[in-house]
Interface confidence: medium
């Protein structure tokens, strides 16, 4: 008869470092002591007729245990395979590039240390929860890679590495370990340089706006902008609208920057840089300065007008170029009232880097003259009908403008410039006096008032009434006579005898 030696449990699965209770039993009635052969740490827990129980401790790796016993002089054996599973000690996703260009590939790398059995261990690379790659864990440490094409949607996306130890066939479930996620930052930086709008010339101590724009930038909000005039960094205001970035600054040139300079705009994103440069000439152009001997002179005074500009400039004064052509021009004049308010304009032209720069300055001359009262602006004789509406006009001229008063008998004023009803007391001779800091002039003005004569009016009215009454009566009598004649004629034609001619009532 053939006897068996059973080992229980059969082909167990346990976690690394665990312990296992093993029972060896035989149905051989005359068996000797049962032995357990294993490289693992073992301890006999109990034994009896045809059986023995052992405890295996600190089981770290897969192993085969063998029980043996002598039965009737023959050795019989039984075995069991122990499968040890262990979760990985380390699952690490390698750092991602600090910035990844959109449209270019990057490599995800995951390293897994430990984990058994390897045949049941899978490494999964993920973007969010999307599987990018699923590979078996091969070597120790297992190193798994996947190539990913970076897109705009990947900006800010978390990537991670997951291990799956599938012990489901052994009834133990799926053990998952996940690495710390790593966030990707993707970017688009166009190959074209920024558009830089800057002046070609900039005068010392003047300011001008500078604009730098770059389109097709992603994410525009993450870009760094550097704007500079020479080595002087400009304080830029950066705005982004969609994929367009605009930096605006004000460039102010200093005296020590005179000459050929560059305005630079750098846009940096993802460790890459795009640069635009524009040449700029910083120049100093003082003047032109217009000088009058005195800005305010009295009539008849000689005035010198001088114009002076940058030593390399060419000036024209009131349209007349300097003789010889150069940075200075002047003219002489005797001040007349017509020169009051006259502008003296000096234009200077300076050549800067092949370009002509123009500047102007204008000064006004004030000529003090007067006062004046002449016939044209202040007539000496006015004749107005009584009760009519009139506005007495008298304009005094001079600089400064004179104060004008017209008085009759030194007390009664003529209301200059005001509308008045002409009365007899307005009549008379007025003395008009114009006074300013430049002196005083007087002029006599006579006002005549025409009064109507009433007897002429009455005669005229009576005569008109008589004439009109006579004309009316004559017309009436003529018409009556005509009608009577017509009636008589009609009666005669009918054969009716005529009655004596009596006064008929008018029809």
């Amino acid at each position: 008869q053939e006897f068996l030696l059973r080992v229980e449990p059969q082909n167990p699965v346990l976690s690394a470092g665990g312990s296992l209770f093993v029972n060896c039993s035989t149905d051989c009635p005359s068996s000797e002591k049962i032995a357990l052969e294993t490289s693992l740490s073992k301890e006999l827990v109990a034994s009896g007729m045809g059986w023995a129980a052992f405890n295996l401790s600190n089981v770290t790796g897969n192993s085969r245990i063998l029980c043996s016993v002598y039965c009737n002089g023959s050795q019989i054996t039984g075995s069991s395979n122990i499968t040890v599973y262990g979760l990985p000690e380390r699952v690490e996703l390698a750092p991602l590039p600090p910035w990844q260009p959109v449209g270019q590939n990057f490599t995800l790398r995951c390293q897994v240390e430990g984990g058994s059995p390897r045949t049941s261990l899978t490494v999964v690379l993920l973007r969010w929860e999307e599987e990018l790659s699923r590979q078996p864990a091969v070597e120790e440490p297992a190193e798994v890679t996947a190539t990913v094409l970076a897109s705009r949607d990947d900006h800010g996306a978390p990537f991670s590495c997951r291990t799956e130890l599938d012990m489901q066939p052994q009834g133990l479930g799926l053990f998952v370990n996940t690495s710390a996620p790593r966030q990707l930052r993707t970017f688009v930086l166009p190959v074209t340089p920024p558009r830089l709008v800057a002046p070609r010339f900039l005068e010392v101590e003047t300011s001008w706006p500078v604009d730098c724009t770059l389109d097709g930038l992603f994410p525009a909000s993450e870009a760094q902008v550097y704007l500079a005039l020479g080595d002087q960094m400009l304080n830029a205001t950066v705005m982004n609208h969609g994929d367009t970035l605009t930096a605006t600054a004000t460039a102010t040139a200093r005296a020590d920057q005179e000459g050929a300079r560059e305005i630079v705009c750098n846009v940096t994103l993802g460790g890459e840089r795009r640069e635009a440069r524009e040449n700029l000439t910083v120049f100093s152009f003082l003047g032109p300065i217009v000088n009058l001997t005195k800005p305010e002179v009295s009539e008849g005074t000689e005035v010198t007008v001088k114009c002076e500009a940058h030593p390399r400039a060419k000036v024209t004064l009131n349209g007349v170029p300097a003789q010889p052509l150069g940075p200075r021009a002047q003219l002489l004049l005797k001040a007349t009232p017509e020169d009051n308010g006259r502008s003296f304009s000096c234009s200077a032209t300076l050549e800067v880097a092949g370009q002509l720069i123009h500047k102007n300055q204008t000064r006004e001359l004030r000529v003090l003259y007067g006062p004046r009262l002449d016939e044209r602006d202040c007539p000496g004789n006015w004749t107005w009908p009584e009760n009519s509406q009139q506005t007495p006009m008298c304009q005094a001229w001079g600089n400064p403008l004179p104060e004008l008063k017209c008085l009759k008998d030194g007390t009664f004023p003529l209301p200059i410039g005001e509308s008045v009803t002409v009365t007899r007391d307005l009549e008379g001779t007025y003395l008009c006096r114009a006074r300013s800091t430049q002196g005083e002039v007087t002029r006599k003005v006579t006002v005549n008032v025409l009064s109507p004569r009433y007897e002429i009016v009455i005669i005229t009215v009576v005569a008109a009434a008589v004439i009109m009454g006579t004309a009316g009566l004559s017309t009436y009598l003529y018409n009556r006579q005509r009608k009577i004649k017509k009636y008589r004629l009609q009666q005669a034609q009918k054969g009716t005898p005529m009655k004596p001619n009596t006064q008929a009532t008018p029809p």
Epitope: Q111, T119, Q135, V138
Partner: antibody, heavy 119, light 112 residues
């Protein structure tokens, strides 16, 4: 063009050390694993070990553990192998080669560095 | 370690002939992931080894189609359909399924 350029021949005394370099070009250095192989007249080709330039992790053939030390300098895309306590048994031609991260084949090899250990 | 045994040690051929080299492993080269990491290299005189075939039967880029690989488990073969002068040198098989990676002793292909 993918290339692995090794340093020139070395003549060293017994007991000394030698450091061989392998400069990679034409590909992303951290994307592939660098392996080292010994070729001696008596024993043919022997695999010494490998290093992952990205992680810096190494795996050695137990026969060469303590004899060879593998390192990389990512900034210069160069792999190094230092051989210590040299004896005449270490006289050989040493090759560097590269392979993908998966256990694939060594697709590109350096030209080899001859090391002669002699007093 | 997986011991790789190549036969023959030397293979004299005439140009245009067919050639066959055998490689046997002391253990199966089938990885737990199902792939078999058995590769063939050629070392021409005075040069470094160069890859011909990877994972049993895949020709590396630039390798002529007169080279072919076959086999499974522990037995593998490299065949050359028509030997040319540039094919002369020492052929090695190698495995990377198990650590340490190991090489065969080499087969010298020479002109008769």
């Amino acid at each position: 063009e993918i290339q692995l350029q090794q340093t020139g021949p070395e003549l060293v005394k017994p007991g000394a050390s030698v450091k061989i370099s392998c400069k990679a070009s034409g590909y992303s250095f951290t994307d592939c694993i660098i392996l080292w192989v010994k070729q001696s007249h008596g024993k043919g080709l022997e695999w010494i070990g490998k290093i992952n330039p990205y992680f810096g992790t190494t795996t050695y053939n137990l026969k060469f553990k303590g004899k060879a030390t593998l390192t990389v300098d990512k900034s210069s895309s160069t792999a190094h192998m230092q051989l210590n306590s040299l004896t005449s048994e270490d006289s050989a031609v040493y090759y560097c080669a590269r392979k993908e991260a998966y256990p694939d084949a060594m697709d590109y090899w350096g030209q080899g560095t001859s090391v002669t250990v002699s007093s | 370690d997986a011991v790789m045994t190549q036969t023959p040690l030397s293979l004299p051929v005439s140009l245009g002939d067919q050639a066959s080299i055998s490689c046997r492993s002391s253990q199966s080269l089938v990885h737990s992931n199902g792939d078999t990491y058995l590769h063939w290299y050629l070392q021409k005189p005075g040069q470094s080894p160069q890859l011909l075939i990877y994972k049993v039967s895949n020709r590396f880029s630039g390798v002529p189609d007169r080279f072919s690989g076959s086999g499974s488990g522990t037995d593998f073969t490299l065949k050359l359909s028509r030997v040319e002068a540039e094919d002369l040198g020492v052929y090695f098989c190698s495995q990377s399924t198990h650590v340490p990676y190991t090489f065969g002793g080499g087969t010298k292909l020479e002109i008769k």
